[in-house]
């Protein structure tokens, strides 16, 4: 159940896809990745107010219990709902290899 | 890639499964669920320090970028890796029905 997409906190404040530019050094990959030199990392950032993009029944429960016991139960969290693929060219002992990753870049987001 | 299970913050402080007892009223279900009257809600709660139970490459990236830009990029978040099913007996217009939910109770947790 993908619930409401209206953010009660104001535009852009709730869970959504953001892009962060990162170098291989930023990612700690400089010693094992050759290419690409820079990654446009798409990630899920933002608040998850009541029922906003609730991923499933568990997220709805979490919202209810967080309202009741905010010190015990955290609010739902903004995480990837799916991913975009990416190719890295990696250094190996024998030269270079092509490595595909299906879980590297967030494609869209939900709250859970 | 399921990374380290050792919690550097001390026992029980990192991302793990917790059980929270909740009534139908707590969950806002009293008007549509008959049974069970009370649910032992299993959910994922706790901190996600560097590489602790990192769900995938995306979680590892998030850790690196959070270290660099803590005000922009949040730390990974503790969420369900899988779920346990649960049966609810629900009120319907014609009486009652048995409904199975596959996404209600967390089974185990990881950081993402």
């Amino acid at each position: 159940a993908r619930n409401g997409d209206h953010c009660p906190l104001g535009p852009g404040r709730c869970c959504r896809l953001h892009t962060v530019r990162a170098s291989l050094e930023d990612l700690g990959w400089a010693d094992w990745v050759l290419s690409p030199r820079e990654v446009q990392v798409t990630m899920c950032i933002g608040a998850c107010p009541s029922q906003f993009r609730a991923a499933n029944m568990h997220a709805q429960i979490k919202t209810s219990l967080h309202r009741l016991k905010p010190d015990t139960v955290p609010a739902p969290c903004c995480v990837p709902a799916s991913y975009n693929p990416m190719v890295l060219i990696q250094k190996t002992d024998t030269g270079v290899s092509l490595q595909t990753y299906d879980d590297l870049l967030a494609k869209d987001c939900h709250c859970i | 890639a399921r990374n380290g299970d050792h919690c550097p913050l001390g026992p029980g402080r990192c991302c793990r499964l917790h059980t929270v007892r909740a009534s139908l009223e707590d969950l806002g279900w009293a008007d549509w669920v008959l049974s069970p009257r009370e649910v032992q809600v299993t959910m994922c709660i706790g901190a996600c320090p560097s590489q602790f139970r990192a769900a995938n490459m995306h979680a590892q990236i998030k850790t690196s970028l959070h270290r660099l830009k803590p005000d922009t990029v949040p730390a990974p978040c503790c969420v369900p890796a899988s779920y346990n099913p649960m049966v609810l007996i629900q009120k319907t217009d014609t009486g009652v029905s048995l409904q199975t939910y596959d996404d209600l109770l967390a089974k185990d947790c990881h950081c993402i």
Epitope: S35, P36, R37, V87, V96, L98, T100, D102 | -
Partner: antibody, heavy 118, light 107 residues
Framework: QVQLQQSGPELVKPGASVKLSCKAS????????INWVKQRPGQGLEWIGW????????KYNEKFKGKATLTVDTSSSTAYMELHSLTSEDSAVYFC???????????WGQGTTLTVSS | DIVLTQSPATLSVTPGDRVSLSCRAS??????LHWYQQKSHESPRLLIK???QSISGIPSRFSGSGSGTDFTLSINSVETEDFGMYFC?????????FGGGTKLEIK
């Protein structure tokens, strides 16, 4: 904007070698990888190999090992492909292609036509 | 090596038609499939990356779909400038390979 300017057409004799060039402009040369692609008249595309301009590390399609040698000159922002022991089968258009993401080819040179004939 | 088979080899259409071009891989390549257009005596141009991701500057009438072994490039209303050759390319593993191409021509 990113541009890859390739050298002009070549007519060479069988058994000889030839060195094709691809000069990059509009970006930092070491920021993009260079690939070389072969296209015979009326046919499809064949990937020859990849080179990492920062330090010249390269990867070849097994089919072109011994046939092609890829090099770079970072001082002139130029990539080179030398083709050896030429036969009529090597007559083709050769493209250099720049890749930011190594998965696909974003920027292409205009192609160099190589004709091998006695 | 991964073999990419494109079909049909030639497609004759009228401007305004919706067309679908197929690319089939000899083994699963997830989403690691990219599409190019090449007009006569020109260099190829990237149209779609990673099966379905759009490219800046490419008209929105071009779209891609598929995963695994079966992929489709769709043009929802063909324009005269769209005629030419279309190639798919995989980046799941080295060596990168291309399909044999589909020629889109005016009926």
């Amino acid at each position: 904007q990113v541009q890859l300017q390739q050298s002009g057409p070549e007519l060479v004799k069988p058994g000889a070698s030839v060195k094709l060039s691809c000069k990059a402009s509009g970006y930092t040369f070491t920021s993009y990888d260079i690939n070389w692609v072969k296209q015979r008249p009326g046919q499809g595309l064949e990937w020859i190999g990849w080179i990492y301009p920062r330090d010249g590390i390269s990867k070849y399609n097994e089919k072109f090992k011994g046939k092609a040698t890829l090099t770079v000159d970072t001082s002139s922002s130029t990539a080179y492909m030398e083709l050896h022991s030429l036969t009529s089968e090597d007559s083709a258009v050769y493209f250099c292609a720049g890749t930011y993401d190594p998965a696909y080819f974003d920027y292409w040179g205009q192609g160099t036509t190589l004709t091998v004939s006695s | 090596d991964i073999v990419l088979t494109q079909s049909p080899a030639t497609l004759s259409v009228t401007p305004g038609d919706r067309v679908s071009l197929s690319c089939r891989a000899s083994q699963s390549i997830s989403y690691y499939l990219h599409w190019y257009q090449q007009k006569s005596h020109e260099s190829p141009r990237l149209l779609i990356k990673y099966a379905s991701q759009s490219i800046s500057g490419i008209p929105s009438r071009f779209s891609g779909s598929g995963s695994g072994t079966d992929f489709t490039l769709s043009i929802n209303s063909v324009e005269t400038e769209d005629f030419g050759m279309y190639f798919c390319q995989q980046s799941n593993s080295w060596p990168y390979t291309f399909g044999g191409g589909t020629k889109l021509e005016i009926k």
